[in-house]
């Protein structure tokens, strides 16, 4: 990896990087690795002993559009014999993601990064038990 | 791109798509704040299929660190706390963005990146193959 | 106003245990990971091992490997630094300091003011 | 591990002096930072990232440097300047600091 050279700062010297307003970054929108593929095992969400389902929730002034949440399907978790074990729990695994937001202020447009939080699947956990004295 | 509704009383000159460059403010909104409580982050101890978490650091993404999930055993923990090897612990697997410094080292300019990464382990039942 | 402040000095026999908190505030405490460095006497400075208060995820240092557990709580906001099987070479000024997991080329920013632990028999 | 090497251990300096402490790792790292120390108190990020001042730090102070090789210079030494300075690297792990360098008034 490329290491700066002596009297420049950690960043290029401005002139070597694109011009860019106070106050905002640059951000070009065509996704590196765009194509790539989750190879996940088949169908996990409904081999998982802490099934889910997916939701797609669609904003058009959101960029990606789609994001998809995953929910789990049971309190409990599924035992060998597929019923539902309430001594566990079917908790929710979380990610963070960024999108991109267009905003509309009148007849101008803003656009605001969002740090947003996906739902991508469900675990199966031995409760916590907190002991009333 | 995607289509964006549009003010009817606004010129007709802006494109509907997302445009390939924007410019964005600094900072950053967290959509993050108000979320459930009860979320825990002792869940990759207490799952049947637990996992342990390895720190990846690149100074030229943005977040530069990212904790990804390695599945402790191929098989699940049962009832009695060993592994079960008539079971699989598998990773969840997640496409994100991040921003990717480019150029490199340019404080201000960034492009969207998409990568993969593995959030948790799950407990699931095999498939099993026959041979015929 | 960002502040890190740990808990008091501690005194220890070889083979015990301590635990060390560091209460953080003024700042969104998951979006920062705490590192510990510790400070023997009249000595340079030593790197411990990293907590991420939002994932859990923990790394050490070999050499602590097995004897430093570090934790965090993200209801109070408070991280925690536990030493085992202690031995008067632990004898020194623990220290928490804060990482951004988004831009890491800041490094660690804020410090705690130490937490001094002397192992003695 | 990485060990980096810092030099001189310690330095006798004169208020308005030009004073250079250099610090050498043993493979190659990417940025270096510097923190300042003074007796009884915690260590302080002086300069991050090889080149970038830390708020609140006079720009009489400067980093420089690449691979093995880094710096931290004072152009002129003002009294609030004496203290150990320590150089760190977070490129490999374990993450590693320098032995100090003390600065003291001759």
């Known amino acids: 990896r490329k290491i700066p050279k002596v009297g420049h700062t950690f960043f290029q010297k401005p002139e070597s990087c694109p011009p860019v307003p106070g106050g905002s970054m640059k951000l070009d929108i065509g996704i590196i690795n765009e194509n790539q593929r989750v190879s996940m095992s088949r169908n996990i969400e409904s081999r998982s002993t802490s099934p889910w389902n997916y939701t797609v929730t669609w904003d058009p002034n959101r960029y990606p559009s789609e994001v998809v949440q995953a929910q789990c399907r049971n309190l409990g978790c599924i035992n060998a014999q597929g019923k539902e074990d309430i001594s566990m729990n079917s908790v929710p695994i979380q990610q963070e993601t960024l999108v991109v937001r267009r905003k509309h202020q009148g007849c101008s447009v803003s656009f605001q990064l969002e740090k947003v939080l996906v739902t991508v699947g469900c675990t199966c956990v031995t409760p916590v038990i907190h002991h009333v004295q | 791109g995607i289509t964006i509704p549009r003010n009817p009383g606004c010129p007709n000159s802006e494109d509907k798509n997302f445009p390939r460059t924007v410019m964005v403010n600094l900072n950053i909104h967290n959509r993050n704040t108000n979320t459930n409580p009860k979320r825990s982050s002792d869940y990759y101890n207490r799952s049947t299929s637990p996992w342990n978490l390895h720190r990846n650091e690149d100074p030229e993404r943005y977040p530069s660190v990212i904790w990804e999930a390695k599945c402790r055993h191929l098989g699940c923990i049962n009832a009695d706390g060993n592994v079960d090897y008539h079971m699989n612990s598998v990773p969840i697997q997640q496409e994100i963005l991040v921003l990717r410094r480019e150029p490199p080292h340019c404080p201000n300019s960034f492009r969207l990146e998409k990568i993969l990464v593995s959030v948790g382990c799950t407990c699931v039942t095999p498939i099993v193959h026959h041979v015929a | 106003e960002v502040q890190l402040v740990q808990s008091g000095a501690e005194v220890k026999k070889p083979g015990s245990s301590v635990k060390v908190s560091c209460k953080a505030s003024g700042y969104t405490f998951t979006d920062y990971e705490i590192h510990w460095v510790r400070q023997a006497p009249g000595q340079g400075l030593e790197w411990i091992g990293v907590?991420?208060?939002?994932?859990?995820?923990?790394f050490y240092n070999q050499k602590f490997d097995g004897r430093a557990t570090l934790t965090a709580d993200k209801s109070t906001s408070t991280a925690y630094m536990e030493l085992s099987s202690l031995r008067s070479e632990d004898t020194a000024v623990y220290y928490c300091?804060?990482?951004?997991?988004?831009?890491?080329?800041?490094?660690?920013?804020?410090w705690g003011q130490g937490t001094t632990v002397t192992v003695s028999s | 591990d990485i060990q980096l090497t810092q030099s001189p251990s310690s330095l006798s300096a004169s208020v308005g002096d030009r004073v250079t402490i250099t610090c050498s790792a043993s493979s190659s790292i990417s940025y270096i930072y510097w923190f300042q120390q003074k007796p009884g108190k915690s260590p302080k990020r002086w300069i991050y990232a090889t080149f970038e001042l830390a708020s609140g730090v006079p720009s009489r102070f400067s980093g420089s440097g690449s691979g093995t090789d880094y710096t931290l210079t004072i152009s002129s030494l003002q009294p609030e300047d004496f203290a150990t300075y320590y150089c760190?690297?977070?490129?490999?792990?374990?993450?590693?600091f320098g032995q100090g360098t003390k600065l003291e008034i001759k």
């Open positions: 300091t804060r990482y951004y997991r988004y831009e890491s080329f800041y490094g660690m920013d804020y």
């Open positions: 907590n991420d208060p939002e994932s859990g995820g923990t």
């Open positions: 760190h690297q977070r490129s490999s792990y374990p993450w590693t």
